[in-house]
Interface confidence: low
Amino acid sequence: SEVEYRAEVGQNAYLPCFYTPAAPGNLVPVCWGKGACPVFECGNVVLRTDERDVNYWTSRYWLNGDFRKGDVSLTIENVTLADSGIYCCRIQIPGIMNDEKFNLKLVIKPAKVTPAPTRQRDFTAAFPRMLTTRGHGPAETQTLGSLPDINLTQISTLANELRDSRLANDLRDSGATIRIG
């Protein structure tokens, strides 16, 4: 089943996806596509990285994080209702059938006419910009409260950096929990 993320019309949507490079600079190709992950590759590719750089992207789709550290989370700018649907993040690990595939469901809600002040925010809103470090050093595993039981070693970030990050504050404010270690 897909993990669900929400954003409002006109906002930027954030779809998290991470892996841990074997060493800084040892990047793995990644593709993002609209639609569930097929057997191979990504369908309707909106962004792609190779072993060195982001080599293909389309309007409104970009990587806000540090893809060199394995943060290949997708940002979709200024979303509309048409952006709703399943997105595939495919980490193209060398070898036969080694790819890591993540299907993420994006739900776009109509914009509120009169937004009421609140500290309770969507999971997506709690991640306006994921922590982006060049992130060198030991990677630790983190568990995000609203993620399912998937292999988080593959999608880890530097938890020691997270301890003091704005992301941790956002998570705390939003009611989501983060367990480090």
Epitope: A23, P24, G25, L27, R129, T133, E161
Partner: antibody, heavy 117, light 108 residues
């Protein structure tokens, strides 16, 4: 054409805090890394640290306890604060853009900071 | 920390000659993240080469970079008068980002 301009006092007293600002013009501060580098007189380049516009930072461990780099996206600026300065912190301070893959492709012209009483 | 050692410290050559500058790393550097910069007196450094071998925008093709792992080279095929300057290598693949000590290319 993106340009960077450093600004701040050219003279700082020992034990005080050095404060510099880098203004980004001709482009957005978004989606890149923004670095501070310094060069003592007659010496080589030393990386101080960088900030991503999201606010994430990475500092040179040798200076980490004294350095703070911050960003103000609304003003298209990022800043350096270096506390408890000594004469050894006298240098030309540069700000530079780093796209992540392409290296530091745009630099400010540098500003000289002298630490002296 | 990756220490970058540049050699020679000073290179004395005449215009038209070939310059070969070396940068050696204390541990392996991903070639994707090795850059070369040129700095003239009173000026900021200028990016010449990124990714060990790719020329930055506007850099003449007499400048070329090569190497991988721990050994990298900047070659200036035919020195022009404006090429006499200090050259720095830099690795930006692991923290802290580090620069070499520089090689001064001076007129013989």
């Amino acid at each position: 054409q993106v340009q960077l301009q450093e600004s701040g006092p050219g003279l700082v007293k020992p034990s005080e805090t050095l404060s510099l600002t880098c203004t980004v013009s001709g482009g957005s501060i978004s989606r890149h890394y923004w670095n501070w580098i310094r060069q003592p007189p007659g010496k080589g380049l030393e990386w101080i640290g960088y900030i991503h516009y999201s606010g994430s930072t990475n500092y040179n461990s040798s200076l980490k306890s004294r350095v703070t780099i911050s960003v103000d996206t609304s003003k298209n600026q990022f800043s350096l604060k270096l506390s408890s300065v000594t004469a050894a912190d006298t240098a030309v301070y540069y700000c530079a853009r780093d796209t992540g893959y392409y290296g530091m492709d745009i630099w400010g012209q540098g500003t000289t900071v002298t630490v002296s009483s | 920390e990756i220490v970058l050692t540049q050699s020679p410290g000073t290179l004395s050559l005449s215009p038209g000659e070939r310059a070969t500058l070396s940068c050696r790393a204390s541990q392996s550097v991903s070639s994707s993240y090795l850059a070369w910069y040129q700095q003239k007196p009173g000026q900021a450094p200028r990016l010449l080469i990124y990714g060990a071998s790719s020329r930055a925008t506007g850099i003449p093709d007499r400048f070329s970079g090569s190497g991988s792992g721990t050994d990298f080279t900047l070659t200036i095929s035919r020195l022009e008068p404006e090429d006499f300057a200090v050259y720095y290598c830099q690795q930006y693949g692991s923290s802290p980002l580090t620069f070499g000590g520089g090689t001064k290319v001076e007129i013989k």
